[in-house]
């Protein structure tokens, strides 16, 4: 199961990086329902993460790297939440 989860994460991450390079960011992820805020991150009145734009005007390698790492962390948190929720739901049956 963990291998499957890692596979999903890596595939999702690759797709998001493709979108980042094309300047699309997380719009299509939102359409597929991968939105939502991070635990311990933005508060209840936060703008949906999906609506946030790029991290400014910098296009150097360090800025790109930090954005990529942020996306990876974000997806790991979102998919981790989903996985935990599935396990929780199965346990209730």
């Amino acid at each position: 199961r963990r291998d499957v989860a890692h596979g999903i994460l890596n595939e999702a991450y690759r797709k998001v990086l493709d979108q980042l390079s094309a300047g699309k960011h997380l719009q299509s992820l939102v359409a597929r329902g991968v939105g939502g805020s991070l635990g311990g991150g933005a508060g209840d009145d936060a703008e949906p993460l999906s609506k946030r734009h790029s991290d400014g005007i910098f296009t150097d390698s360090y800025s790109r790297y930090r954005k990529q790492m942020a996306v990876k962390k974000y997806l790991a948190a979102v998919l981790g939440k989903r996985y935990k929720q599935r396990v929780k739901n199965k346990g209730r049956r």
Epitope: A46, D55, G56, I57, S61, S63, R66
Partner: antibody
Framework: SVEESGGRLVTPGTPLTLTCTAS????????MGWVRQAPGKGLEWIGD?????TTDYASWVYGRFTISRTSTTVTLKMTSLTTEDTATYFC????????WGQGTLVTVSS | AAVLTQTPSPVSAAVGGTVTIKCQSS????????LAWYQQKPGQPPKLLIY???TLASGVPSRFSGSGSGTEFTLTISGVQCDDAATYYC???????????FGGGTEVVVK
């Protein structure tokens, strides 16, 4: 421009939350960082928050500080404050800290 | 955490002269070029001058330039002006952002 608020005199151990707001640009469009400067000393990088809400902190933070954001604010929550945390706290835009606020002074004293 | 060591303060310069400030990192910065330079005047917040080791930030005069790679970096001010009197800081960005740190600062005095 960027503006910090919430700095004040507190006693050791008192938690404190600083707030960063922006005018002239959409705060939610940028990663935001926090930096501090003790009186007469140099700059110290605290950490930053991405547009996705993910955070990174300097190794010395040890979980005492938490950065979070909404669509209009970025906050720095500080716990277990000691006199060593007395400093001016700056909020700055994006990973390269290209636009800074004037800072807000936090004084920790008994 | 990384340690960034800057040229000791103060550094003196004559108007029209050239100032060189060095910044040495205890470990290589990300992609060998993730280093920025800031200028801070008393009572003011820092101002970004250079990022990615050598890229001039928007609105910064061309008399400021940055160079270096890996662990050794230099900020050069050519044709120094009175307005350049300030403290200059370098900031290193690393593979693990937990290592990010500023140098101790170098004060530039203009005669």
């Amino acid at each position: 421009s960027v503006e910090e608020s919430g700095g004040r005199l507190v006693t050791p151990g008192t938690p404190l939350t600083l707030t960063c707001t922006a005018s002239g640009f959409s705060l939610s469009s940028y990663a935001m960082g926090w930096v501090r400067q003790a009186p007469g000393k140099g700059l110290e990088w605290i950490g930053d928050i991405s547009t996705y809400g993910t955070t990174d902190y300097a190794s010395w933070v040890y979980g005492r500080f938490t950065i979070s954001r909404t669509s209009t604010t970025v906050t720095l929550k500080m716990t277990s404050l000691t006199t060593e945390d007395t400093a001016t706290y700056f909020c700055a835009r994006d990973y390269w800290l290209s636009l800074w606020g004037q800072g807000t002074l936090v004084t920790v004293s008994s | 955490a990384a340690v960034l060591t800057q040229t000791p303060s103060p550094v003196s310069a004559a108007v029209g002269g050239t100032v060189t400030i060095k910044c040495q990192s205890s470990q290589s910065v990300y992609d060998n070029n993730a280093l920025a330079w800031y200028q801070q005047k008393p009572g003011q917040p820092p101002k970004l001058l250079i990022y990615a080791a050598s890229t001039l930030a928007s609105g910064v005069p061309s008399r400021f330039s940055g160079s270096g790679s890996g662990t050794e970096f230099t900020l050069t001010i050519s044709g120094v002006q009175c307005d350049d009197a300030a403290t200059y800081y370098c900031l290193g960005g690393y593979y693990d952002p937990a290592d990010n740190a500023f140098g101790g600062g170098t004060e530039v005095v203009v005669k």
